[in-house]
Interface confidence: low
């Protein structure tokens, strides 16, 4: 009996040591990544940013609200998380890509056009699970039908054509608050990733029945957080198999 108890304790201790080793390895990996990020940002210590500040800085769109709330739940959950998902399973990651300006876009018809997206190397065409363009439509005064058109910029053709349609949809808007609208752009994104030179940007139009453009493309001083953006979900296939 004594022997079996002793053996059990040794096994338990061995398992705990393994857990501790794994946890320490994970922690040191995370710390190393944090140090890299801070050095890239030229910061000595991590900024102390509250959830409220994050809410102000990020676009005010549904997927980001969900992410922030999710992060909050994770942070509040003090129970030890399982390492299993982390180490052995395929995970999906949501990457939010904000538009950047492109010289080419700025020259179209002498007016600024939105939007041009530069993609993280993490986004590979065969790993894209979902890609949605989110646009904010300003509030309307009367019930109206809105025609949303997403056009892809192309190199000017002989006939002068600069655009090709990606998506168009018709939606009814009622007075009140503006709305966030998502549009599936997975195929376009995959094509851009295969042929980066074809990525010259897009133009967003959301015209009501009177030709009034409701899409926020270049947020003004009072439109912080209403930029269009891409929500891309990528899958990260497992790098290790269970030993």
């Amino acid at each position: 009996n004594e022997n079996s108890e002793q053996k059990e304790n040794v096994e338990k201790e061995g398992l705990c040591n393994a857990c501790t080793w794994r946890q320490n390895t994970k922690s040191s990996r995370i710390e190393a990544i944090k140090i890299q990020i801070l050095s890239k940002l030229r910061l000595e210590t991590a900024p102390n940013i509250s959830k409220d500040v994050i809410r102000q800085l990020l676009p005010k769109a549904p997927p980001l609200r969900e992410l922030i709330d999710q992060y909050d739940v994770q942070r509040d959950d003090s129970s030890d998380g399982s390492l299993e998902d982390d180490d052995y399973h395929a995970t999906t990651e949501t990457i939010i890509t904000m538009p950047t300006e492109s010289d080419f876009l700025m020259q179209v018809d002498g007016k600024p056009k939105c939007c041009f997206f530069k993609f993280s190397s993490k986004i590979q065409y065969n790993k894209v699970v979902k890609a949605q363009l989110w646009i904010y439509l300003r509030p309307v005064e009367t019930p109206t039908t809105v025609f949303v058109q997403i056009l892809r910029l192309i190199k000017p053709m002989k006939d002068g054509t600069r655009y090709t349609g990606i998506r168009s949809l018709k939606l009814d808007m009622n007075p009140g608050t503006g709305i966030w609208q998502s549009i599936d752009v997975k195929t376009v994104l995959q094509n851009w990733l295969k042929q980066p030179e074809s990525n010259l940007g897009i133009e967003i139009k959301a015209l009501d029945e009177n030709g009034h453009d409701l899409a926020v493309t270049f947020p003004g001083p009072g439109e912080d957080g209403l930029n269009p953006f891409l929500e891309v979900k990528v899958t990260d296939t497992p790098k290790r198999s269970r030993r």
């Epitope: 009072g222 439109e223 912080d224």
Partner: antibody, heavy 119, light 110 residues
């Protein structure tokens, strides 16, 4: 129906503080920017300041240090406070939806309220 | 400080004539097109006519049109109507929460 209405004192003494209220209806202030613009009698329009839907404030350079714009979303009100009033501040003060010069801002205005600064 | 200059100060034309109002900014407006035109009649608040330099606001007659980019802008009324007698203002946005109005052009109908 969407409306904006300015209210406040019609007469203010020099060095006193002016407080004007813009009461909106049919507008959600958490989704709408409000601008203040003034117009001296017989003169042109002059931009005063903005409070964005997110509560960010932007003031005209001449008004910095004297001007505060705040809002109470639950009361549907935007408040302009200007200290150290001077006779040159005599003007009709307007509140407007959105930001004039940005997109279709300034598509809706209050009727304005004439404020006279005099002892 | 930003200065927006409108010319002429007064424009006196007959009904049916074409009116051309000019607005010049001392520095380029943001994104080359953050410019609006407003119409104001005595005792009334301003009315938005044109935004993004050339986009006609909701409910504005098509005889009004806007053009230009950067620092030079024009408001054109193709065929003046008696009800167009008013003062017209341009308003420019410069990013960073900076805005300015022109001093106005008064349009009189002979």
């Amino acid at each position: 129906q969407v409306t904006l209405k300015e209210s406040g004192p019609v007469l203010v003494k020099p060095t006193e503080t002016l407080t004007l209220t813009c009461t909106v209806s049919g507008i959600d202030l958490s989704h709408t920017d409000i601008s203040w613009v003034r117009q001296a009698p017989g003169k042109g329009l002059e931009w005063v300041g903005i409070i964005s839907y997110a509560g960010k404030k932007y003031y005209a350079s001449w008004a910095k240090g004297r001007l505060t714009i705040s809002k109470d979303t639950s009361k549907n009100q935007v408040v302009l406070t200007m200290t150290n009033m001077d006779p040159v501040d005599t003007a009709t003060y307007y509140c407007a939806r959105g930001v004039p010069a940005y997109s279709h801002g300034g598509d809706l205005w209050g009727q304005g309220t004439l404020v006279t600064v005099s002892s | 400080d930003i200065v927006m200059t409108q010319s002429p100060a007064t424009l006196s034309l007959s009904p049916g004539e074409r009116a051309t109002l000019s607005c010049t900014s001392s520095q380029s407006v943001y994104h080359a097109n953050w410019l609006s035109w407003f119409q104001q009649k005595p005792g009334q608040p301003p009315k938005l006519l044109i935004y993004w330099a050339s986009t006609l606001a909701y409910g504005v007659p098509s005889r009004f049109s806007g053009s230009g980019s950067g620092t030079d802008f024009t408001l054109t009324i193709s065929s003046l109507q008696p009800e167009d007698a008013a003062t017209y203002y341009c308003a420019g946005g410069y990013g960073g929460g900076r805005y300015a109005f022109g001093q106005g052009t008064k349009v009189e109908i002979k």
